[in-house]
Interface confidence: low
Amino acid sequence: EPTMYGEILSPNYPQAYPSEVEKSWDIEVPEGYGIHLYFTHLDIELSENCAYDSVQIISGDTEEGRLCGQRSSNNPHSPIVEEFQVPYNKLQVIFKSDFSNEERFTGFAAYYVATDINECTDFVDVPCSHFCNNFIGGYFCSCPPEYFLHDDMKNCGVNCSGDVFTALIGEIASPNYPKPYPENSRCEYQIRLEKGFQVVVTLRREDFDVEAADSAGNCLDSLVFVAGDRQFGPYCGHGFPGPLNIETKSNALDIIFQTDLTGQKKGWKLRYHGDPMPCPKEDTPNSVWEPAKAKYVFRDVVQITCLDGFEVVEGRVGATSFYSTCQSNGKWSNSKLKCQPVDCGIPESIENGKVEDPESTLFGSVIRYTCEEPYYYMENGGGGEYHCAGNGSWVNEVLGPELPKCVPVCGVPREPFEEKQRIIGGSDADIKNFPWQVFFDNPWAGGALINEYWVLTAAHVVEGNREPTMYVGSTSVQTSRLAKSKMLTPEHVFIHPGWKLLEVPEGRTNFDNDIALVRLKDPVKMGPTVSPICLPGTSSDYNLMDGDLGLISGWGRTEKRDRAVRLKAARLPVAPLRKCKEVKVEKPTADAEAYVFTPNMICAGGEKGMDSCKGDSGGAFAVQDPNDKTKFYAAGLVSWGPQCGTYGLYTRVKNYVDWIMKTMQENSTPRED
C-alpha cells in the first residue's frame, strides 16, 4: 500500500550491522507524488566505489545514488546528511555488507516523505501538447480555442477527420487553408468512389506548403496517400514534391495529414476526380460495334450487331445483336457471347421430291431440291437451289423461303401407244400407254386422272353413284389384277351445274355438259403406270379441227364382248358434228329429233369402225398438245353415241377448263407438307 512517509533503518541500527547482509526496501507513495528521501545518519564501511558495503538508491532502472563512509550535516539547523528527490512515486533502497568489517559500523537511518511534483516543468518530456496545469498530486492538460483534448487527455488537436468523399470529383484542403494548419493534429480523409473508377489526385506545386523535413530527411509534418497496399508519400516541404497527377488505380483512397507541435505553414489543397476504368476494344469477329469509339471506359454501353448470316446463340434463343457494358473491373459484360454463323438446320422434306443431306447447314451453305423425275417436276420454278440466308431460312432466289412444289408431269405416257394387230375397231393397249386411264367398276366406265387429287369423268357415269370405286395403274381389270392395283377413294363428286339430272336417266336425249370431277380422299402417287393427262389450254391453239387425231382408251364393249378385261385403245379423227347427227340412233329411246347436239360436244370416229362404246364413258379423248408434241391433253371425254362402231360424241373439255380450275381451287385442302 502506498504511504505518504516512512523510516528506513539499517539492520540492528543503531548497533553495528552484521556481515554478509543484503536487504532491500520498496518505497511507494500515491500516484501523482514524488519521493523525498533523506539520510540523518550514515556510518558504513568506506571503500572505492562503495564496493564492500553500501546503501543503493534505485529509481526504475536508474541508480540515483550509492552511499558509504561517514557523513555529517553541513547545516547546524538540519540533521540531513544526504538527500534525494525523485519525481516518481516508487523507489528502491538496497543495503549490502560484505563478509568482514575491520571496524564497528552502525549503518544508516533514512526517512522518506511524499512530495508534490510539477509534471508541467519537472520532466524533459512535456506531458501536454498545449497547456499544462499542475495541482498537488497531479496535473491536467487544456487546449486553446477551437482545439479539443484527445482521449489520451494530453494532446490537443483540431477536428479534421471523418470526412468521406463519394462524389466523382471534389476538392480537399488542410484545415484553415490557406491560413496555417493546426499543430499536433492527425487529419484523415477518405475518398470512396463506386467501383469502376480510380481516384486521380491532382496537386499543383503552388498549392502545397508543409513544414520541411529534418536534417535526416524525415518529414516533421507530412501528407500521405494510401490506396489499398500502395502508399504515396509522405510528402512535405515548400512546393508539392510529388507528381502532378497521382493515379491510385483504386476507387478507395485514404489521405493522412500529420502535424507536430511546431512550424505551421499554409498547408495544402488538392483536387481529385474519378477516372473511369478503360475496357479494351476487343476484336469480336463477324460483328460491328455501335457506337464506334477510339476508347471505351466504365459504364460505356455498346451494341454489338452480328453481320448478316451470323447470330448470337444464348441457350436456345438466337438474336442478331446484344448489349455489352464496360464493367468496373475493366472487362466487358456478355464477353462470352459471340456472333456465330446462322444455322438453318436440316432442310424440310417435300412431297414427291428429295433434298440431298447437306454437308453443312450454316450460313452460305447450298442445298438442291429435286423432284422424282420423270413423273414429277418443280411447279413453282426457282431451279430447286436454296442457300442458308442470314435470317436462318433456306432461301431460293425466285421463291424466297417458300419450298418448291413437285407436281405430277401430265400427258406423257411411259410407252407410246402403237396400233398392233387390228382387233375389231381397236387394239390392245398397255396401261403405260394411257397412265391417266381410270377404271370405274360401278357403273363400268372410265375416267381421266388430271392431278394427284382429281379425276375427270362424264357426268352420266357418276350421277347414279356418288361414291364410285376407282382403280388406276392396271392394264387388266380382272378382279385378281384389280386387287393388286391402286384403288382410289372418292371424297366428293362434283357434277357440272349445267348437267340436267333426270328421274329416268335411261331415256336421256340431252348429254350437254356431260362432265364431272371426283375429288379423291388421298393423293395419288405417280409412276410409270399412273400419271395424269393435261388439260387443254384456253388459247385458239387448242381448238380442234376436223381430221385432228385423238386417242381413246377403255374397257368398254367390243364387237366380241360386252366388257373388255384388258385395256383397248384406238386412234380416231375429229369429224364434223353433222356426221354424228346423220348416224341413225341404235335402239332409240326417243324420237331422233329429240337428241341434243351442242358446241360443247366433239364428234369423232367413223374410220375403220373405230369408236368408243358402252363402258368407255368418261375416258379421255387424248390429243397431242400443239405446243409440246411429247404431251397429250384431254380434248374430250367419252360421252354418248348414236351407234357403236360409227361416230361418237365427246364432251369438249376446253369449254369447261374454267369450271374445272374453279372447282378444284375452291375444294382443295392445304397440303400437309
Epitope: A167, L168, I169, H273, G274, D275, P276, V288, E290, P291, A292, A294, K295, V297, R299, D300, V301, Q303, T305, S321, Y323, T325
Partner: antibody, heavy 119, light 105 residues
Framework: EVQLQQSGPELVKPGASVKISCKAS????????IHWVKQSPEKSLEWIGE????????TYNQKFKAKATLTVDKSSNTAYMQLKSLTSEDSAVYYC????????????WGQGTLVTVSA | DIVLTQTTAIMSASPGEKVTMTCSAS?????MYWFQQKPGTSPKRWIY???KLASGVPARFSGSGSGTSYSLTISTMEAEDAATYYC????????FGGGTKLEIN
Amino acid sequence: EVQLQQSGPELVKPGASVKISCKASGYSFTGYYIHWVKQSPEKSLEWIGEINPTTNDTTYNQKFKAKATLTVDKSSNTAYMQLKSLTSEDSAVYYCSRDISGPAWFAYWGQGTLVTVSA
Amino acid sequence: DIVLTQTTAIMSASPGEKVTMTCSASSSISYMYWFQQKPGTSPKRWIYDTSKLASGVPARFSGSGSGTSYSLTISTMEAEDAATYYCHQRSSDPTFGGGTKLEIN
C-alpha cells in the same frame, strides 16, 4: 431530374468567336458524354461532336473540326462549345445533349442557344 | 458519311387516318432512330433500335425497316402528333434526315 441548362442567345459579328455553355444537373456529370448538335433551316440537324467529361476525350464530326472546340469544367458541371471564325452560315440553334447508358444517344437535350452572326 | 433522305418534306393527315413516313439511307445501316420536334422545343427521342418506343411515346406509333429502307407509322393520327419527325443513324458518325413535317387537316 436530369437538366441541361444552356446559355442565352448570342449576336456576334462575322469573324468573331463565341463560347456557349451547358450546365448539367440532376446526375453525375462525369458519368456521361455530352454531345453538341447544330440545327439550321438549311441543313436540319447536324452532329458536331462529343466530349467525355471525366477524361476530356473528344470526338468531332470532320466538318466541324476546325470550327468547334469542346471543353468541360468539372467543378461547375458545365460543358462549353467555342465556335470561331464565324460566318452567316454558322447562324443556327445549337443544342447540348446527354447520352444514356444503353441503346441511344441524345437522350436528354438542352433548350438550345440561338447564335446569330450579323454585321 | 451516311446520308439519310426523308423524301416527303411536308405531309398532312386527318384525325384517325393512318400515316406512314419513310427514311432511306445511302448505305445499309443496322438500326434507325426517330426524333419528334415541335416548334420552339428541343427534339425528343421517339423511336430507337428501329422499332422500340421511347418511354412516354403512345402505342399508336411504330417503326420498322432494315438495310437502307425504314419507316415510322402512326396507326390513327391525333392532333398532338402534328410535329416534325427526324430520322437518325449512328452506324457511323451520327447523321440526321432532313425531317418530315406532319400537319393535321
